[in-house]
Each structure stands twice: as structure tokens, then as C-alpha cells.
Interface confidence: low
């Protein structure tokens, strides 16, 4: 295509010979600026046509000769006004003007649609001097026209600060239809209407559109471009394209696939990323989305224990990030887990179920009914309790941890004891007399130490007291009891 610029063109000298009125009287060009590419254009339009000079934009010279005879007005001669040709053909057109020899130099420039065209590879200026005038022919050629070369071309010449403008030469490049809008692939709901758009331009106009669905024409009569095809609905995938026709022939658009949205395929590769006593972190690979974005996923969890009631827990989450931490599970339990995801059409089937187990955890409750009493005869404190409920042990019980704190005037001493899992009683030696002993007990599994029971306090008197009754875990609301027997 033609390069456009806004720079000044360098003027060609009007008389490249030694002096005006050179001996060269024939009509061979005195100076010819050759076409760089050296080809012979396919179309050539003659420089001049017989008839009156163009009078649209003329310059009337102020200079007079010796006889004071006024010079004629200057104007470009008429030339061809409209050139129609096919894409990729060559074209050459020109404008000509006769200029009195009194003008020492001048410039002819070519303009397209209001912008100056630069590039010597397009333009040749030839000079034919005579006694009084020099004929100037400016030719413009394009080797292989494109649609972008369409437009209005003019010559301009500056003389005496006057601008002379030629009649326009309209170039119309014709070719096969050119798409400005093609149908786009879409994902649509089954049996729901949708539109496809196709637009193509010439020249030549008009451009007519035929629609094609799965290789068969949809419309018997063509529609003028642009065309909107309303498809009332599809039940299965289809490929659409459009044909654009003009006098030069036919262009076919790309074929676009229209997919029918469906429920997604079930997720695959559900896997366990991490297990704790009360949670399982799972991930999955989403199945095919059914041509509609995933919105949510549902994680279904059921106890794998054959004695369980078979109820299913459901956890909903967003489709991203294909990762979910299932919480509030029991420790040391087996679960079956499945995942299903949804798009706007509906839910997928559930993925293949996988088995997962929670690990052992620390017990979630403390031992119950803690009772403490003093056995003076052996100078021991006896402690009794009840096991936490099996369900809340969160693992296999390996023992108990007993904290006993001894406090008397100015002294505080805490000791920890570990006892085996079989018993539900322990005996500890009195550490300090005339002191308060505070006892708390926690259950222990391989998963860790559970919470400690509420403190139970007993006063250990000085030697010589007679009888001792037990202290127990206080009833709710009785804070911090100290039983002195």
C-alpha cells in the first residue's frame, strides 16, 4: 500500500539543462526520474485528453513578457477521473500541466484523501521543455493494488506562492468480499435461541450473505450484508459459517462450533492430601465443564462403619481451588468421600467414592467425676475418676496425666504424674502438710493430651487430725471449693 507522510517533497529543478530554452526541441523528456521497480504497469492511463484545460484551481501569473502580454492561467489538464480495477493488479495514472519557462523551479506532489504521499518508488516526474513552456507529466504507479489503496488522488503544484490542484482521480479497488465481522464460537443452552452475525464488504457492493450449518445452506435467499442469523435452538453441537458473495466471487468465513451446554462430567482423581483427627483435606481434578463454567462443588461424606446409620454429610464450596478441608469429623474413623460439581445447567454425577481415615487425636473431653481424699494412715492422697466417653477419647487411651499443686504459706509446688490406661485411680504422696492440694487430670492418647478436668482442692492438715472425707469435682456453679475436714 502507499506510504503516507507529511514531510515536504524536494522540488525537482524545472530546467536541469544549462539554460532555459535549451537546444533540445523534440519531446523526449529532458529529465526522467525512473520508477525504481522497473516493471511495466498493467494499466496505463494517458497523460492528457484533448479539450480545455482544467479550470477548477488556476494560478494567474503576474509576470508579463517584453510585449507585456499577460500569461495564460495555469491549470492541470483533465485526465481520467475514475479507475476501477481488481485487487493485486498494477495501475499507473498521471496528471500533466504546461508551465511557462519563466518559472525556475516548481514542485508537483501527490496527495491521497488529504494526506501527502511520499516515496519515489511510486512517482515519476517527466519534463518536456519547449521554447516558451515546459510540459510536466507526473505519473503515479502502484504495482499490486490493495483495498487500502482505494481513494481520491490529486496532484498539487506550487507556483508564485499559489497552489494549483488537479481534478481528483478516484481509484476503486475491487475484489472478493472481505469480512469485517465473522460469527463467533458460542456455548449455548439446549433449545434456546441465539444470534450469529456476519458482515462483509466490497467493493464491489452489494455483498450477499448465505448461512451454512453443518455444510448445508440455511437460507435459500441471500441476505444483504450485514446479516444476523437467529437460530431458534439446537439440541446438538453444530458448525456454522457464512458465505459472502459479490460480483467478483465468493469468500467463506471460518467455521465456528456452537456447543450445547450440559451438566459437567464427574470430578476425577479425588485424593487425600492430609488427614488430622477431625479433618481431611481432599483435592480433585474437575471433569469436563460441559461448556459452562463450574460454579460450586459439593463434597459428600458418609461413615464407612457398617454399624453407622448411613447418613451423608454434605459440604458445599466454590469450584476453585479444587481443594477442600472437611471438618468436624470424628477421630480414628473411616469415611467414604465423593465430589460432585455444578455449572449453570446442573450437578455432575458424583465422582468415584474414595475411602479415607482420620488420625488419632488428643481426647476432646476430660475424665469425669474426679474425687480426691486424704488417707492419713499412709500419708497419701487417693484420686479416683471415670474414663471419658469412648467417642470422645479420639483415639486409643494410653494413660492419664495428673497435675497436683501444693500451696501453703509462701510455698507453691506443682508436680505431674503419668499413670497407665487401665486404672481409674491413683495414689500420690503428701508433699506438704498444712497446705492445699489442687488436683487436675487429663486423658492421654497417642494423639496428645486432652483437656484437664476442673480443679479439685483438698486441705492437708498438720499431723494429728482424726478423720478425712473426700473432695470431688465441684458441681457446676460451685467455684473453687476447699474442703477442710
Amino acid at each position: 500500500a502507499i506510504t503516507e507522510a507529511r514531510e515536504e517533497a524536494k522540488p525537482y529543478p524545472l530546467f536541469p539543462g544549462p539554460f532555459p530554452g535549451s537546444l533540445q526541441t523534440d519531446h523526449t523528456p529532458l529529465l526522467s526520474l525512473p520508477h525504481a521497480s522497473g516493471y511495466q504497469p498493467a494499466l496505463m492511463f494517458s497523460p492528457t485528453q484533448p479539450g480545455r484545460p482544467h479550470t477548477g484551481n488556476v494560478a494567474i501569473p503576474q509576470v508579463t513578457s517584453v510585449e507585456s502580454k499577460p500569461l495564460p492561467p495555469l491549470a492541470f489538464k483533465h485526465t481520467v477521473g475514475h479507475i476501477i480495477l481488481s485487487e493485486h493488479k498494477g495501475v499507473k495514472f498521471n496528471c500533466s500541466i504546461s508551465v511557462p519557462n519563466i518559472y525556475q523551479d516548481t514542485t508537483i506532489s501527490w496527495w491521497k484523501d488529504g494526506k501527502e504521499l511520499l516515496g519515489a518508488h511510486h512517482a515519476i516526474t517527466q519534463f518536456y521543455p519547449d521554447d516558451e513552456v515546459t510540459a510536466i507529466i507526473a505519473s503515479f504507479s502502484i504495482t499490486s493494488v490493495q483495498r487500502s489503496d482505494n481513494g481520491s488522488y490529486i496532484c498539487k503544484m506550487k507556483i508564485n506562492n499559489e497552489e494549483i490542484v488537479s481534478d481528483p482521480i478516484y481509484i476503486e479497488v475491487q475484489g472478493l468480499p472481505h469480512f469485517t465481522k465473522q460469527p463467533e464460537s458460542m456455548n449455548v443452552t439446549r433449545n434456546t435461541a441465539f444470534n450469529l452475525t456476519c458482515q462483509a464488504v466490497g467493493p464491489p457492493e452489494p455483498v450477499n450473505i448465505f448461512w451454512v450449518q453443518n455444510s448445508s445452506r440455511v437460507n435459500e435467499q441471500p441476505e444483504k450484508s450485514p446479516s444476523v442469523l437467529t437460530v431458534p435452538g439446537l439440541t446438538e453441537m453444530a458448525v456454522f459459517s457464512c458465505e459472502a458473495h459479490n460480483d467478483k466471487g465468493l469468500t467463506v468465513s471460518k467455521g465456528v462450533q456452537i456447543n450445547i451446554k450440559a451438566i459437567p462430567s464427574p470430578p476425577t482423581e479425588v485424593s487425600i492430601r492430609n488427614s488430622t483427627a477431625h479433618s481431611i483435606l481432599i483435592s480433585w481434578v474437575p471433569g469436563f465443564d460441559g461448556y459452562s463454567p463450574f460454579r460450586n462443588c459439593s463434597i459428600q461424606v458418609k461413615e464407612a462403619d457398617p454399624l453407622s446409620n448411613g447418613s451423608v454429610m454434605i459440604f458445599n464450596t466454590s469450584a476453585l481451588p479444587h481443594l477442600y478441608q472437611i471438618k468436624q469429623l470424628q477421630a480414628l474413623a473411616n469415611y467414604s468421600i465423593g465430589v460432585s460439581c455444578m455449572n449453570e445447567i446442573g450437578w455432575s454425577a458424583v465422582s468415584p467414592w474414595i475411602l479415607a481415615s482420620t488420625t488419632e487425636g488428643a481426647p476432646s473431653v476430660a475424665p469425669l467425676n474426679v474425687t480426691v481424699f486424704l488417707n492419713e494412715s499412709s500419708d497419701n492422697v487417693d484420686i479416683r475418676w471415670m474414663k471419658p466417653p469412648t467417642k470422645q477419647q479420639d483415639g486409643e487411651l494410653v494413660g492419664y496425666r495428673i497435675s497436683h499443686v501444693w500451696q501453703s504459706a509462701g510455698i507453691s509446688k506443682e508436680l505431674l504424674e503419668e499413670v497407665g490406661q487401665n486404672g481409674s485411680r491413683a495414689r500420690i504422696s503428701v508433699q506438704v502438710h498444712n497446705a492445699t492440694c489442687t488436683v487436675r487430670i487429663a486423658a492421654v492418647t497417642r494423639g496428645g493430651v486432652g483437656p484437664f478436668s476442673d480443679p479439685v482442692k483438698i486441705f492437708i492438715p498438720a499431723h494429728g487430725w482424726v478423720d478425712y472425707a473426700p473432695s470431688s469435682t465441684p458441681a457446676p456453679g460451685n467455684a473453687d471449693p476447699v474442703l477442710i475436714i
Partner: antibody
Amino acid sequence: QVQLQQSGPELVKPGASVKLSCKASGYTFTSYDINWVKQRPGQGLEWIGWIYPRDGYTKYKEKFKGKATLTVDTSSSTAYMELHSLTSEDSAVYFCARGFYSNLYYFDYWGQGTTLTVSS
Amino acid sequence: EIVLTQSPTTMATSPGEKITITCSASSSISSNYLHWYQQKPGFSPKLLIYRTSNLASGVPDRFSGSGSGTSYSLTIGTMEAEDVATYYCQQGRSIPLTFGAGTKLELK
């Protein structure tokens, strides 16, 4: 071709609210999420949240819950983000971006950004 | 949230150099979820590479990406002046979606 055209720059006072817009063209608006991303001057990119135009489903980064409200008008293929109780910390360029949802979330087209200046 | 750490923060380069930017994730992500963006001064970010190694439309093949697990990298085979920009990695694995802090490439 796909384009996201965002509204012009905003100068607002602290404590006020502002509503930014993002007009989509060149694709089916209801088929892709619109995300919003914040960029403080000279800083990196921070995801605010997304909205799915078909059903208005939203997802926010925790820190923007209550600060940003995402909405859409499907009839004009326009997404909006309203920012509330503005402070100087909210001065930033806000981008809208189309989320390519193929189980591996990325942003394939971006708006040109809206500059928000919060100043008294 | 997954934190993405980019290095270096800034880099002065010359045309023709080979450039490598790294992005480290705080936890392992599949390579499907790591993407790269280019942001030139005064412009919005542009998708450069998606799914670790796939070039987005119109991106010159001097750009490439690789990595797995927690470690990813973006390479410019031969630096050109037009590549001066800030580059961000982004993960799509976990909500919130997060970006690296960016690597700024400058010319010496």
C-alpha cells in the same frame, strides 16, 4: 475483538463512596467472570474479587469484604465496583480483567484501568 | 493464602542479554495454575504466559516459561528494548488469587 472499557479518573473525598464501571464488548459477557485488581502507585497487583455476570455470583478476597461491592448490568454488558468509606489507602489504579475459567484461573483481557484519588 | 515471591525485584539489562526471572510459591501448585503477565509503564498488565509455559497470543517466542511444584521461571532468550516492563507471576490454584510482587526490567 474483546475489549474492556473502564470509566474515567475519579477524585473523591475521604469517607465517600465511588462506583467504577467496566464495559465489555467483543464476547459473550455472561460467559466469563469479571475480576477487579488493585494497584497502588509504584506497587504490585492485588486481586479484589470476581463476579459471574450470568447469576451475579461473587467471590471476594477477605480484606475487601465490606470495602468493595461487585455488581453487573447484563443488558449493557457492564460490570461495576463500588468502594465504600474511602480513605487515602484506597487511592490506586483499579483494573477490571476477564477471568479465563478453564479450571486454571488467569486473566486473558484487561481494561485500561481507572485512577482513583482520595483526597480532601 | 499462597504467597508468590519473585526475584530479583529489579534488574538492569542490555539488549541481547538472556534474562531469567524466578517465582517461588509458599506451597506447591500444579504447573497448570502458574501464569505470567507483562506490564509496561502507564499501561495495564498483559497476559504473557499461561499454564507455566504456554505463550499467549501475539507474544514473541523469545519468551519462555518453565517450572513445577513451588519453583517457576520466566526467560527472555534475547532481551530487546521493548521488553522493558514489570513482570508478575500469578497463581490460580487457591482463593484468594495472588500475584508476585513483580520484577522490574530496566535498560543499563
